[in-house]
Interface confidence: low
C-alpha cells in the first residue's frame, strides 16, 4: 500500500512543482521524493524498507499518475542509498537518495529544487507546502493526481511536550501542525518546501494522522548538507 | 439514516451548569471518519461551533468557551453529552448537535452532514 | 466578529439568479461548506468542498471558492428558497467557523 498521503490539501496546480518525484514501486506509487539535482531524486530511507526484490523507479514531470503528459517520465535507479545511520525502529537519519539510471531531461515541468544548506531553524509560524499523491478518503480511494496543503512549522520546544513528540524531535528534524491537515505515512519522502526552497524531507515513521497533538515529522535537509555534498560527488 | 436528538432542560439558572445530551441512532458514535459536534445560535444570530469529540474520543473545544466546556460520552448509550458551566444570559441560544464528517482522518473537520432539530436553551433566574 | 463575513440579507425575484457571498482571509486554504436554514429548522447541507452537493439537493444550487471569497449560487431562486443561509470554513486555528449568515428574500 502507498505509504502515505496528503490530508486535507487540495489538488495542486498541475506541474508547479518540477521538483516533485513519484518513487515507485513494481509501477505503484510507494512515496514522494524531490529531485536535487539532474540524476538525483532525495526521498525516505523507511520507504524502501519493504522494498526487497521489487522493481524501483522515479517517475518525473507527473501531475496524473496514469494519464498521458508529454513531461512525464519513467526513470530506473541505478544506485539507492540510505543514509548511513537510518534505523528501521527510529525516524533519526531518515533520507534517501536515488540516482537515476540517466540525468533527467529538465524543462518546465522537471527541475530540481533547490535545498537549504543554511542549517537554521525555519521560524515557527512560516507557511509551507507539502504535496504527495495517495489515500484520500477513508474508502482508500487514492488520488490520480498531485495533492498538496499548506502548513505551519511548529516550534520544537512545542513538538516535543510530553503531550506530543515527547522529546523525540532532535536538531536534525523539524515540526509542522497537523491540526486535521497534515502528512501521512505514505507522503514520506516528499518535500517540505518554505519560501521555495526545500527544508525538509517527509519523515516515513507510523504516526497518527491529522491530530494536532501529533505533528508532522520532518528531517532537515540542511542538517545533512555534508552527506548529501558527499553522495552527489 | 443517521439521527440524532438533542435533550435536557431548556431553562437553566445564571451561574449554574448547563447540560445537554445528543442521543445518536442509526450509526455508532465510535465509527472511524466522523466526529461529533455542538453549535449554538443565539436568537437572532449566526451560529457558533462549540466544540467537537472524535471517535477516539478526544476533544476540541472553541477556544472563547474552552475554560467553561466540556464534551464527554457514553459509548455504550451511543451518547454524547455537553457541559457548559458559569452561564449568563448571553449563553441563551437553541443548541444542535451534529455530526462533523471527515474525509481524510478520524478528525479532520470538514462539515456537518447531520444536525439534530436543536433544543432552545434559556438562562434567567 | 466572525473570521468569515456575509452579506446580512439579500432579495432576490422569483426565478433569478441568486449570489450569496462569504469572504474570509483563509479560504484559500480551506474548503468552503454551506448550510440552508428555513425558520424553526435545523440547518441543512446543501453544497460542500466548495462546489459538490449532496444528493437530494436540486441543481440550481453550485458553489465556488476563489481568491478569498465563497460563492453560493442560486439559479432561478424558488419561493422555497427563502431562509438563511450560512457558509461554515476554518480558522486560522483550523477550528470550525460559521458567517454571520444571509437572509435570503424571494420576491
Known amino acids: 500500500p502507498p505509504r502515505g498521503r496528503i490530508l486535507g490539501g487540495r489538488e495542486a496546480e498541475a506541474h508547479a512543482r518540477p521538483y516533485m518525484a513519484s518513487v515507485q514501486l513494481n509501477g505503484a506509487h510507494l512515496c514522494g521524493g524531490v529531485l536535487v539535482a539532474e540524476q538525483w531524486v532525495l526521498s525516505a530511507a523507511h520507504c524502501l524498507e519493504d522494498a526487497a526484490d521489487g522493481k524501483v523507479q522515479v517517475l518525473l514531470g507527473a501531475h496524473s499518475l496514469s494519464q498521458p503528459e508529454p513531461s512525464k517520465r519513467l526513470y530506473d535507479v541505478l544506485r539507492a542509498v540510505p543514509h548511513p545511520d537510518s534505523q528501521p525502529d527510529t525516524i533519526d537519519h531518515d533520507l534517501l537518495l536515488l540516482q537515476l539510471s540517466e540525468k533527467a531531461t529538465l524543462g518546465p515541468a522537471v527541475r530540481p529544487l533547490p535545498w537549504q544548506r543554511v542549517d537554521r531553524d525555519v521560524a515557527p509560524g512560516t507557511l509551507c507546502d507539502v504535496a504527495g499523491w495517495g489515500i484520500v478518503n477513508h474508502a482508500g480511494r487514492r488520488p490520480d493526481s498531485l495533492q498538496h496543503v499548506l502548513l505551519p512549522v511548529l516550534d520544537r520546544a512545542t513538538c516535543n511536550r510530553r503531550t506530543h513528540h515527547d522529546g523525540a524531535i532532535t536538531e536534525r528534524l523539524m515540526c509542522a501542525e497537523s491540526n486535521r491537515r497534515d502528512s501521512c505515512k505514505g507522503d514520506s519522502g516528499g518535500p517540505l518546501v518554505c519560501g521555495g526552497v526545500l527544508e525538509g524531507v517527509v519523515t516515513s515513521g507510523s504516526r497518527v494522522c491529522g491530530n494536532r497533538k501529533k505533528p508532522g515529522i520532518y528531517t532537515r535537509v540542511a542538517s545533512y548538507a555534508a552527506w548529501i555534498d558527499s553522495v552527489l560527488a | 439514516q443517521v439521527q440524532v436528538q438533542e435533550s435536557g432542560p431548556g431553562l437553566v439558572k445564571p451561574s449554574q451548569t448547563l447540560s445537554l445530551t445528543c442521543t445518536v441512532s442509526g450509526g455508532s458514535i465510535s465509527t472511524s471518519y466522523y466526529a461529533w459536534s455542538w453549535i449554538r445560535q443565539p436568537p437572532g444570530k449566526g451560529l457558533e461551533w462549540m466544540g467537537d469529540i472524535a471517535n477516539d474520543g478526544s476533544t476540541y473545544y472553541s477556544p472563547s468557551l474552552e475554560s467553561r466546556v466540556t464534551i464527554s460520552r457514553d459509548t455504550s448509550k451511543n451518547q454524547f453529552s455537553l457541559q457548559l458551566s458559569s452561564v449568563t444570559a448571553q449563553d441563551t441560544a437553541v443548541y444542535y448537535c451534529?455530526?462533523?464528517?471527515?474525509?481524510?482522518?478520524?478528525?479532520?473537520?470538514?462539515?456537518?452532514?447531520?444536525w439534530g432539530q436543536g433544543t432552545l436553551v434559556t438562562v434567567s433566574s | 466578529s466572525s473570521a468569515l463575513t456575509q452579506p446580512p440579507a439579500l432579495s432576490v425575484s422569483k426565478g433569478q439568479t441568486a449570489r450569496i457571498t462569504c469572504q474570509g482571509n483563509?479560504?484559500?486554504?480551506?474548503?468552503a461548506h454551506w448550510y440552508q436554514q428555513k425558520t424553526g429548522q435545523a440547518p441543512k447541507l446543501i453544497v460542500y468542498d466548495d462546489n459538490i452537493r449532496p444528493s437530494g439537493i436540486p441543481e440550481r444550487f453550485s458553489g465556488s471558492n476563489s481568491g478569498g471569497v465563497a460563492t453560493l449560487t442560486i439559479s432561478g431562486a424558488q419561493a422555497e428558497d427563502e431562509a438563511d443561509y450560512h457558509c461554515?470554513?476554518?480558522?486560522?486555528?483550523?477550528?470550525?467557523?460559521f458567517g454571520g449568515g444571509t437572509q435570503l428574500t424571494v420576491l
Open positions: 451534529a455530526r462533523l464528517r471527515s474525509l481524510y482522518t478520524d478528525y479532520d473537520p470538514h462539515y456537518y452532514d447531520y
Open positions: 483563509l479560504l484559500p486554504r480551506h474548503y
Open positions: 461554515q470554513s476554518a480558522d486560522s486555528n483550523d477550528d470550525a467557523v
